[in-house]
């Protein structure tokens, strides 16, 4: 394809690009202490840092918008670092009837890239 | 479910939050006027706006997104506003032997939300 | 480390009850639950149920329901595990074991307790 | 109840073959399946969860895979430290269930 391809080198030094980083969270910060049991506390991976021209691209829309950006930056935002795919997780909750196993399939990220 | 829901009424006032605003772009702003014949001209649909808390979440991740956020701004970055979907778009193309019509499934955004 | 102790073997005339305790240490007793599973001579590994140390919370299962009872002691991070009316197939080996985490996995285990129930 | 079924019940091999054990649900479990190895008189070692994850600390001769109702432990190259009894687990749903375990034995 004649698309400018997304690079993987991050321009602006080790760990300021678009990353996946784990964050601790508990059941508390969460607010779902009420109703969630187990595990109280939970590793988090989330997306996070800056997504410099064409770092990661998730699709031609997202190049397009760096393009874009660079000619217009108060019309176009840059391009923004959000989860690509995501990993389940498993909480106990309390329910009307004791307690369950809960799948979360939209908790955890597993990659990130820049859309 | 007991989880916060997404909320659609944006707090920041009109047009502030994330919404889906077209953007006329031109195939030389886009760096495509060499290999597409047409049309010269394109609406680009594209997502901009803030995302408060809990405004369009995307789905659960985003919402623990927003509140960690609050909880720790510096570590953890606001979700953002990002396509939801695509509207596909045909464009002519110059091929080796002659003119193609192709078919872009991810250029033109259709629906946004927070993430 | 993580670990969980267990205390030592106990000998039990049929009828009479066990309580079996499981020390954890080196993470915060409260994030997690524990298990209790149980192991007859030659035979494989049958699930007696689970606790949330936080809350409380139990789940038994169905054919222990009304012998057995988990409860915790958040104070000394200790679990325990009463089997009442104790039959002699109820000689085993009782595990405990920490989870199920996150991704549903039971990752630490407390070297077990070998209960004999014999007239 | 998840049933959940393993075979075979037993395995002979001998040090470097690559050996594969399965275990069904009765009905689907998402990934929510562990494996374990157990040694006569010692507790269970958590080898593999998630379906597929290794345990920190496990050896990579030892894999996972499988999701929904099937799923397969393969030890790559067999380890004289390797023989013992294999059970998996599910956690998709109380109550917690255990295959009927497979014992690798020396040929």
């Known amino acids: 394809s004649a698309h400018a391809h997304p690079r993987d080198s991050c321009p602006l030094g080790p760990g300021r690009c678009c990353h996946l980083e784990t964050v601790q969270a508990t059941l508390e910060d969460l607010g779902w202490s009420d109703w969630v049991l187990s595990p109280r506390q939970l590793q988090l991976s989330m997306c996070v840092g800056e997504c410099p021209h064409l770092y990661r691209s998730a699709n031609t829309h997202a190049q397009i918008k760096a393009r874009l950006h660079g000619l217009q930056p108060d019309k176009v935002p840059a391009p923004c670092c959000v989860p690509s795919s995501y990993t389940p997780v498993v909480l106990m909750h309390r329910t009307d009837s004791g307690v369950s196993l809960q799948t979360y399939d939209d908790l955890v990220a597993r990659g990130c890239h820049c859309a | 479910s007991a989880h916060a829901h997404p909320r659609d009424s944006c707090p920041l006032g009109p047009g502030r939050c994330c919404h889906l605003e077209t953007v006329q772009a031109t195939l030389e702003d886009l760096g495509w006027s060499d290999w597409v014949l047409s049309p010269r001209q394109l609406q680009l649909s594209m997502c901009v706006g803030e995302c408060p808390h809990l405004y369009r979440s995307a789905n659960t991740h985003a919402q623990i997104k927003a509140r960690l956020h609050g909880l720790q701004p510096d570590k953890v970055p606001a979700p953002c506003c990002v396509p939801s979907s695509y509207t596909p778009v045909v464009l002519m193309h110059r091929t080796d032997s002659g003119v193609s019509l192709q078919t872009y499934d991810d250029l033109v955004a259709r629906g946004c939300h927070c993430a | 480390q993580v670990q969980l102790v267990q205390s030592g073997a106990e000998v039990k005339k049929p009828g009479a009850s066990v309580k079996v305790s499981c020390k954890a240490s080196g993470y915060t007793f409260t994030d997690e639950g524990i298990n209790w599973v149980r192991q007859a001579p030659g035979q494989g590994l049958e699930w007696m149920g689970w606790?949330?140390?936080?809350?409380?919370?139990?789940v038994y299962a169905q054919k222990l329901q009304g012998r057995v009872t988990m409860t915790t002691d958040t104070s000394t991070s200790t679990a325990y595990m009463e089997l009442r009316s104790l039959r002699s197939d109820d000689t085993a080996v009782y595990y405990c074991a920490r989870g199920p985490g996150q991704y549903a996995d039971v990752d630490v285990w407390g070297q077990g307790t070998m209960v004999t129930v014999s007239s | 109840d998840i049933q959940m079924t393993q075979s075979p019940s037993s395995v002979s091999a001998s040090v470097g073959d690559r050996v594969t054990i399965t275990c069904r649900a009765s009905?689907?479990?998402?990934?929510?399946l562990a494996w374990y190895q157990q040694k006569p008189g010692k507790a269970p070692k958590l080898l593999i969860y998630a379906a597929s994850s290794l345990q920190s600390g496990v050896p990579s001769r030892f894999s996972g895979s499988g999701s929904g109702t099937d799923f397969t432990l393969t030890i790559s190259s067999l380890q004289p430290e390797d023989f013992a009894t294999y059970y998996c687990q599910q956690a998709n749903s109380f109550p917690i269930t255990f295959g009927g375990g497979t014992k690798v034995e020396i040929k």
């Open positions: 009905q689907g479990i998402s990934s929510w």
């Open positions: 606790i949330t140390a936080y809350s409380g919370d139990t």
